[in-house]
Amino acid sequence: SEVEYRAEVGQNAYLPCFYTPAAPGNLVPVCWGKGACPVFECGNVVLRTDERDVNYWTSRYWLNGDFRKGDVSLTIENVTLADSGIYCCRIQIPGIMNDEKFNLKLVIKPAKVTPAPTRQRDFTAAFPRMLTTRGHGPAETQTLGSLPDINLTQISTLANELRDSRLANDLRDSGATIRIG
């Protein structure tokens, strides 16, 4: 089942995905695609990283966090209703059938029509993240027998619009991450 994330038309959407590299520099290729994760790779790839860099991306899709430390969360800029749907984050761990696949459902809501702004609303518009809530869901852990010392933790519900890369560290300590090594 997919975890659901929401954004309004015109906002940036945030789809979280994390892993912890086994050691600094030991990056794992990651792909993001539109549509549920297929058996292999990602369908309709929008962004891809390799062992060193982001090596493919399309307009409006980017990584805002520190992907060299495993924060491969996807930001989609200036979303429209057409961006609704399932997105696949695939951590491409070496070995046969070792990939971790995460299906994230993005729901785009029409932009709210707001009355003429008051001073207080101006403040809220200037600092929208002050009002963001951050939810941590339960985690489910599995161990791969075919790769020694690789511990994978299923991504669970993270708050929408988490943009600060430091939060990756808070989240991984609450189980919202994949640990490799």
């Epitope: 912890t20 590299p21 086994a22 050691a23 600094p24 520099g25 030991n26 982001v54 980017w62 990584l63 805002n64 966090g65 520190d66 992907f67 060299r68 430390k69 890369s165 430091r166 560290n169 991984r172 300590d173 640990r179 090594g181």
Partner: antibody, heavy 125, light 108 residues
């Protein structure tokens, strides 16, 4: 303020091993990679390796593989470096240094924003 | 390995002078270059990151420039506390780092 406090100077015999420590304070230890750097007397700086305190994974300069072993103790926010089979060439000051904050994906790697005071190692018979 | 060559090895200046220290990389490193100051019997201190980005708490007389293979650290009106050794470091080959040989800034 962020501080990295290193263990004191040591005098060791050739062939011995030494384990030095670097205790971090005033920041979340697991959030920043920790580097170790060697400075021989009157010489430049040489990067030894880096460790991720979150999971203990380490990456080494090829020159120091088998010579240096990096470990951490998350519970005490302490990083360790063990140097083995010491020779006179290993006499130096050794620093721990924290990788700085993430600065954006258009840059590669990190600067080292906080350094320990150094541990002096003298290898002599 | 990327080699960083610093020049000059020693620079003798009078307080109040403005100076420029050079760091040249053996291949392009974009702007993944950082500058450190080390005073006698002290640890290195980060002065500039990513070629030109200032560091909180570092006096504004220190500035950095360059990209690709040629970089410079400028000190506008040197003060007596600025004497010491200056090192450049590249992070382009992260997680493997290398340092330059250093430039010693001394009083004339």
């Amino acid at each position: 303020e962020v501080q990295l406090h290193q263990s004191g100077p040591v005098l060791v015999k050739p062939g011995a091993s030494v384990k030095m420590s670097c205790k971090a304070s005033e920041y979340t230890f697991a959030d920043y990679y920790m580097n170790w750097v060697k400075q021989s007397h009157g010489k430049s700086l040489e990067w030894i390796g880096v460790i991720n305190p979150y999971n203990g994974g380490a990456t080494y300069n090829q020159k120091f593989k088998g010579k240096a072993t990096l470990t951490v103790d998350k519970s005490s926010s302490t990083a360790y470096m063990e140097f083995s089979s010491l020779t006179s060439e290993d006499s130096a000051v050794y620093y721990c240094a924290r990788d700085a904050d993430f600065y954006g994906n258009s840059y590669v790697g990190y600067a080292m924003d906080y350094w320990g005071q150094g541990t002096s190692v003298t290898v002599s018979s | 390995d990327i080699v960083l060559t610093q020049s000059p090895a020693t620079l003798s200046v009078t307080p109040g002078d403005s100076v420029s220290l050079s760091c040249r990389a053996s291949q392009s490193i974009n702007t993944d270059l950082h500058w450190y100051q080390q005073k006698s019997h002290e640890s290195p201190r980060l002065l500039i990151k990513y070629a030109s980005q200032s560091i909180s708490g570092i006096p504004s007389r220190f500035s950095g420039s360059g990209s690709g293979t040629d970089f410079s650290l400028s000190i506008n009106s040197v003060e007596t506390e600025d004497f010491g050794i200056y090192f450049c470091q590249q992070s382009h080959t992260w997680p493997q780092y290398t340092f330059g040989g250093g430039t010693k800034l001394e009083i004339k």
